[in-house]
Amino acid sequence: EVEKTACPSGKKAREIDESLIFYKKWELEACVDAALLATQMDRVNAIPFTYEQLDVLKHKLDELYPQGYPESVIQHLGYLFLKMSPEDIRKWNVTSLETLKALLEVNKGHEMSPQVATLIDRFVKGRGQLDKDTLDTLTAFYPGYLCSLSPEELSSVPPSSIWAVRPQDLDTCDPRQLDVLYPKARLAFQNMNGSEYFVKIQSFLGGAPTEDLKALSQQNVSMDLATFMKLRTDAVLPLTVAEVQKLLGPHVEGLKAEERHRPVRDWILRQRQDDLDTLGLGLQGGIPNGYLVLDLSMQEALS
């Protein structure tokens, strides 16, 4: 807390300019009018204030706006944003995408800070849903943003927003998140033709059910092994050798390199060795010839 002291004669600030960098902390407190600061916030960023001086400017704004800053001030905070705490930000009502962009720009190149996370949370909650423009902006600054959301939060993403998602935005998503995103992506891309559809849906396939994988196997998609390895194990297990061969196309020989990794390992264990041998890849671990396969889950359902 800076002491209240009178402003020395002739030092009263008439505008926010470079001369203020020579002011001591107490002089800034005494000589800069908070209302003037609020109207000329856009100038602060261009002036090389010290961190201590910025603390004083923040204090003045806090006194002027105890209930939270108006958006006209927030939009021009610049580096002063880095001085804000999550508690400060929770008082704000940010509705403009331009304001959000301006503040994200300040933090660009750094990991998402608690301040940024709070700002995004306030912004998205204010909008009611994660629309395409917002998602575009957020993933541009933070490629991993989408995967930082809970499945519940992701459920508020409208299918139209999925068009903004790039493959790298999904790199850190877990299966539960893809379970939510996949149906939205399927809906978003439903009017595309076969090959174009596959290019778009590929990144979301970690949430695809068996019947969709079977359908894809009929479309000559040539799925690569990196994508295949991300599929849900429970979705892969019911696929036949012929279906997997069609799904992977020329990439089918890659199964050998991944035969000990899930879901390939578990899928191999469910196939007849005879059928696996037709691939000519040397895959081992299938059900030996002459063995009867009982689907116990089916039997339980019937009893």
Epitope: M229, K230, E253, A257, H261
Partner: antibody, heavy 119, light 108 residues
């Protein structure tokens, strides 16, 4: 440019553990498995195991089972190899090597990390 | 596990001469699953040939590979000074993946 940059040399006492990191850059991290291969002084190459950075799934050479643990941090595009209960014969250069998912050959290697186990 | 035995262990060769290194497997290896690596002193290994005969990116055409079943060969058609290195064969046809013991090629 595709690069695998490993952590620096380590000197450990018998019975201790060592954790080597391998940071990947210049490619899509989740499209490639990361394998670990070691080379004892004046000896040949020995495959230790691999990790799929996308799923976190690991496969270990049985020779190291129970002693080796491979982990990944997708957000940092980094994989780790930890070897525990070290003995003098674990003295070696440890390499991480990139392997495209669906292939079995290593097209890019890290610079190697020398681990010396000595009392 | 499949044991890969390389021969010779060591070879001293004059430049421009042809070099042949063999890799013999203790049981059959599917040819798509065999590769060769080159390692120069104090350097990491480098992929030379994959799938028995495919040259890796940037590898000079004087290198070639062949073979099937249990017998595989790496050939350097006209040795150059920069080829002084140790060469390893590697199989991923059977778990665990294994490497040959290496063949050191020295320039006379």
């Amino acid at each position: 440019e595709v690069q695998l940059v490993q952590s620096g040399a380590e000197v450990k006492k018998p019975g201790a553990s060592v954790k080597v990191s391998c940071k990947a850059s210049g490619y899509t991290f989740t499209d490639y498995n990361m394998d670990w291969v070691r080379q004892a002084p004046g000896q040949g190459l020995e495959w230790m195991g691999d990790i799929n950075p996308s799923t976190g799934g690991t496969i270990y050479n049985q020779k190291f089972s129970g002693r080796v643990t491979m982990t990944e941090d997708k957000s940092a595009s980094t994989v780790y190899m930890e070897l525990s209960s070290l003995r003098s014969e674990d003295t070696a250069v440890y390499y991480c090597a990139r392997r495209r998912i669906g292939t079995g050959y290593f097209d890019v290697w890290g610079q190697g990390t020398t681990v010396t186990v000595s009392s | 596990e499949i044991v890969l035995t390389q021969s010779p262990d060591f070879q001293s060769v004059t430049p421009k001469e042809k070099v042949t290194i063999t890799c013999s497997a203790s049981s059959s290896v599917i040819s798509s699953y065999l590769s060769w690596y080159q390692q120069k002193p104090d350097q990491s290994p480098k992929l030379l040939i994959y799938r028995t005969s495919n040259l890796a990116s940037g590898v000079p055409s004087r290198f070639s590979g062949s073979g099937s079943g249990t017998d595989f060969t790496l050939t350097i058609n006209s040795l150059e000074a920069e080829d002084a290195a140790t060469y390893y064969c590697h199989q991923w046809s059977s778990f665990p993946y294994t490497f040959g013991g290496g063949t050191k090629v020295e320039i006379k």
